[in-house]
């Protein structure tokens, strides 16, 4: 009598995640009587994948009708494959008994699963930073297999080199994740800049996946302040302007102080954008000189994006004759520096 053979013709099968995998198995003889079961892995820790007689295996179906007479084909199809399904599958013949006794195993078929990386997600710094400072961006992508993957960073189309990338886990796994950090030095012109994380993998049809982040979310451009006095009007009123230029984001509060007392507070809103993405704002204050005996100390105080206030102060000379007032006189800065200090 010829010895029963359990034939698994394929040593290995590779499928794409989401597809179905067919694992072939035939037996050379109908005797002895007894069931066939499919396992993943070998030894005592093996996992039962399919048993015709009992159990619920919603993703596993027999390729041919196992109930038909003289059936010797015990191939199975596993639907909706995920990376977690990777492993070596064994078709095992049992001899009928109480309990059934394992008789012979096939050589095993290794199932390899190729899976696409998830769309890269780029996250930036939690708090804004100013020009000349370095900020870090992180890019993450998950669930890919095999492990080989390339990740590149670009800022405005130019590849970044200050990059640290890790693929986890280091050892063999059903799927992998990549995490990369890029360090970017900010400039005042970066409001419209963009960083791109580009991931390439064998499963992608030639086109890398991209994740983006706008530097506008990461940058703060502090304002320049300039206070000027226009020529005195006939009604003894002086028009003083505070020009706040080249700032980002728009969140800005401007306060006028006369001799240290709050005169008016304004909030910036709906400002037109400069070409470089920054904003300008001009505020006017009319000072009635005839209402003052002494010189008036005016302060333009700007609070930008929750940062410490920047002041620009100067004095309106009350003693001077109106006709002698020069036009468009720039104020002296008696307050803090015109740029924020961090």
């Amino acid at each position: 009598e010829e010895e029963l053979q359990v034939i698994q013709p394929e040593k290995s099968v590779s499928v794409a995640a989401g597809d179905s995998a067919t694992l072939n198995c035939t037996v050379s003889s109908l005797i002895p009587v007894g069931p066939i079961q499919w396992f993943r892995g070998a030894g005592p820790g093996r996992e039962l994948i399919y048993n015709l007689k009992e159990g619920h295996f919603p993703r596993v179906t027999p390729v041919s009708d196992p109930t038909k007479r003289n059936n010797m084909d015990f191939s199975i199809r596993i639907s909706n494959i995920t990376p977690a399904d990777a492993g070596t599958y064994y078709c095992v013949k049992f001899r009928k008994g109480s309990p059934d006794v394992e008789l012979k195993s096939g050589a095993g078929t290794e199932l390899s699963v190729r899976a696409k990386p998830s769309a890269p997600v780029v996250s930036g710094p939690a708090v804004r930073a100013t020009a000349e400072h370095t900020v870090s961006f992180t890019c993450e992508s998950h669930g890919f297999s095999p492990r080989d993957i390339t990740l590149k960073w670009f800022k405005n189309g130019n590849e970044l080199s200050d990059v640290q990338t890790n693929v986890d886990p280091a050892g063999k796994s059903v799927s992998y994740s990549i995490r990369s950090t890029a360090r970017v030095v900010l400039t005042r012109r970066d409001v419209h800049s963009q960083v791109i994380c580009e991931v390439a993998h064998v499963t992608l049809q030639g086109d890398p996946l991209r994740g983006t982040a706008n530097l506008s979310e990461a940058i703060r451009v502090p304002p320049f302040l300039e206070v000027t006095q226009q020529s005195m009007r006939a009604d003894n009123q002086v028009n003083v302007t505070c020009q706040v230029t080249k700032f980002y984001p728009q969140r800005l509060q401007l306060t006028w102080l006369e001799n240290g007392n709050v005169s008016r507070t304004e909030m910036a809103s709906a400002l037109p954008e400069n070409k470089d993405g920054t904003y300008n704002w001009t505020s006017w204050l009319l000072v009635n000189v005839s209402a003052h005996r002494d010189d008036v100390k005016l302060t333009c105080q700007v609070e930008h994006d929750g940062q410490p206030a920047v002041n620009k102060s100067f004095s309106v000379k009350v003693s001077a004759h109106p006709k002698e007032q020069g036009s468009n006189t720039a104020a002296e800065n008696t307050g803090t520096n015109e740029r924020n200090i961090y």
Epitope: S14, D148, T150, V202, Q205, D207
Partner: antibody, heavy 116, light 109 residues
Framework: QSVEESGGRLGQPGTPLTLSCTVS????????MGWFRQAPGKGLEYIGI?????SPYYASWVNGRFTISKTSTTMDLKMNSLRSEDTATYFC?????????????WGPGTLVTVSS | DIQMTQSPSSLSASVGDRVTITCRAS??????LAWYQQKPGKAPKLLIY???FLYSGVPSRFSGSGSGTDFTLTISSLQPEDFATYYC???????????FGQGTKVEIK
């Protein structure tokens, strides 16, 4: 699923020539496609690929001599200025469904002969 | 660019023989290697992908092995229809470029 090349002919050195690859049974917007060539009695040589979205990538030796493009149903290889060493059978092929590391569907090839 | 060195460049064998063809990459290509069979005047046919996976419809007498830089195509029992030229082809996941070996012609002894 199949691919077929066309446009191969006798061409003069210095003249342009465009080869086409027509696909059936699948969409060019879903797969990477490649161009290859084989000089008489020689081995296979990779020319370039075009990605599913239409981005071309070339072998380092191409140096701007060839241009790969595609429409919804055909992929083209434009040879800007023929040289005698371009005499070869040109094949187009489609990458496999599992990834871009192998080509599982090949056309029969089209012969380009460059001679004055 | 990666170089693929295939050996031997030709071999003579008889029907039923076990035939082994090797391919060496100038740097690691992991398992991104395919084997093709080509007959005169015909297009290449895919036999093996990912170094060891048999393409559907290809007879099981063909097998592939190896990873990194050294790869092997084995025909366990040569059949009359197997007399052809065999090419290895690599894909490098960093440069995303393809390279072929120079081919191995299997002839009848």
């Amino acid at each position: 699923q199949s691919v077929e090349e066309s446009g191969g002919r006798l061409g003069q050195p210095g003249t342009p020539l465009t080869l086409s690859c027509t696909v059936s049974g699948f969409s060019l917007s879903s797969y990477v496609m490649g161009w290859f060539r084989q000089a008489p009695g020689k081995g296979l040589e990779y020319i370039g690929i075009i990605s599913s979205s239409g981005s071309p990538y070339y072998a380092s030796w191409v140096n701007g001599r060839f241009t790969i493009s595609k429409t919804s149903t055909t992929m083209d290889l434009k040879m800007n200025s023929l040289r005698s060493e371009d005499t070869a059978t040109y094949f187009c092929a489609r990458v496999g469904p599992l990834g871009v590391d192998y080509f599982n569907i090949w056309g029969p090839g089209t012969l380009v002969t460059v001679s004055s | 660019d990666i170089q693929m060195t295939q050996s031997p460049s030709s071999l003579s064998a008889s029907v039923g023989d076990r035939v082994t063809i090797t391919c060496r990459a100038s740097q690691s290509i992991n398992s991104y290697l395919a084997w093709y069979q080509q007959k005169p005047g015909k297009a290449p046919k895919l036999l093996i992908y990912s170094a060891s996976f048999l393409y559907s419809g290809v007879p099981s007498r063909f097998s592939g092995s190896g990873s990194g830089t050294d790869f092997t195509l084995t025909i366990s029992s040569l059949q009359p229809e197997d007399f052809a030229t065999y090419y290895c082809q690599s894909w490098h996941y960093i440069s995303r470029s393809y390279t072929f070996g120079q081919g191995t012609k299997v002839e009848i002894k």
